[in-house]
Interface confidence: medium
């Protein structure tokens, strides 16, 4: 005997990436005859709809008139026919986008340091950003990832002349939307007496300060779900 009904489809219209303060509709398509649909947000009940007449309706819509960071996250829906509930839908990542933002990159103790000094970069973005990336300009696969509500710290540890270069940071929104780059910060490291030779342009960073992430074609993992466009970006994992 069947214990659950087939899972519904969930998608966002016009798109799962929603600019701040814009409207979005979350759609849930189940079966004709469903008497109740539930929308869950981050694992908790968010909204309920009871279509009338249920035998003529197989899709419901949950309208969000004013998208903001508190509404961004994972949604799923379920429905029931009589007392029988469906499997939950796939997860829908609803992302708020504030695409014109530019983070601020700063460095402590300053952009000109002596080899051996401990250096920390700070990337700040005063909007709903969850992840930050610090990139050194040039053909390097070395990227440092940081997290924070408005600011991430990127400790380089004791630097050497190999850390010389121009750095920028980006803020990302749920791995789906990226900010503009920060203004560049040029780090100048004065070499010590024993090692004054110029470093190569893109050195291999010490393992304890930089994650060595080679970004290959396998990095982007795409999952296609019917009726909605969602790219699961397995960034730098």
């Amino acid at each position: 005997q069947q214990q659950t009904l087939p899972k519904p489809f969930i998608w966002a219209e016009p798109h799962f990436m929603v600019p701040k303060e814009k409207q979005v509709t979350i759609c849930c398509q189940g079966n004709y005859g469903a008497v109740e649909y539930q929308l869950h947000f981050e694992g908790s009940l968010f909204a309920v709809d009871r279509p009338k007449p249920p035998e003529r309706i197989n899709k419901v819509q949950f309208y969000i008139p004013d998208m903001n960071s508190r509404m961004a996250g994972q949604y799923s829906c379920i429905y029931r026919v009589g007392e029988l509930w469906s499997e939950p839908s796939n997860l829908l990542d609803l992302v708020v986008t504030e695409m014109y933002d530019t983070p601020t990159l700063s460095v402590h103790p300053g952009p000109e340091v002596i080899s051996g000094e401990k250096v920390t970069f700070y990337c700040r973005l005063d909007t709903a950003t969850s992840m930050f990336l610090l990139l050194k300009e040039g053909r390097s696969s070395h990227v440092q990832r940081g997290y924070g509500k408005v600011q991430a710290e990127f400790p380089l540890g004791p630097v050497t002349t190999a850390h010389r270069g121009t750095y920028r940071c980006f803020g990302s929104y749920n791995n789906h939307a990226w900010s503009f780059p920060s203004e560049p910060v040029k780090l100048l490291v004065t070499g010590d007496i024993e090692n004054t030779s110029l470093a190569p342009e893109d050195p291999t960073f010490p393992a304890d300060t930089w994650g060595t992430y080679l970004l290959t074609t396998e990095t982007g993992l795409q999952k296609d779900h019917a009726l909605w466009d969602h790219t699961a970006q397995n960034l730098l994992r």
């Epitope: 016009p14 990436m17 695409m99 982007g220 790219t231 970006q233 960034l235």
Partner: nanobody
Framework: QVQLVESGGGLVQPGGSLRLSCAAS????????MFWVRQAPGEGFEWISV????????DYAASVKGRFTISRDNAKNTLYLQMNSLKTEDTAVYYC????????RGQGTLVTVSS
């Protein structure tokens, strides 16, 4: 399904020019900042340019600033990169992308700058 298809690459002499195009489909193109990144043989990805959703603001990595120009046509869902004063060190596979690391990108178009 997200699709990004680059074209316009080829062999060019130092000092020459090329214009790359990227046809986007499967997503709301005008909702995204769009990026060009490149990858030289045996190297990692290098972010080189970004343009905002409306196409009125752009930024460039220092290595290409003043030589490359990014633009977009939202009506045609197309991203462009005009490359002037090309140097041998610009030889790479060029990708359009939705992020500065090239995680969501096309198949790329090869640009070879050689005499």
């Amino acid at each position: 399904q997200v699709q990004l298809v680059e074209s316009g690459g080829g062999l060019v002499q130092p000092g020459g020019s090329l214009r790359l195009s990227c046809a986007a489909s499967g997503f709301a193109f005008s909702n995204y900042n769009m990026f060009w990144v490149r990858q030289a043989p045996g190297e990692g990805f290098e972010w080189i340019s970004v343009i905002n959703r409306g196409g009125d603001t752009a930024d460039y990595a220092a290595s290409v600033k003043g030589r490359f120009t990014i633009s977009r046509d939202n009506a045609k869902n197309t991203l462009y990169l005009q490359m002037n004063s090309l140097k041998t060190e610009d030889t790479a596979v060029y990708y359009c992308a939705r992020d500065p690391l090239g995680t969501t990108r096309g198949q790329g178009t090869l640009v070879t700058v050689s005499s």
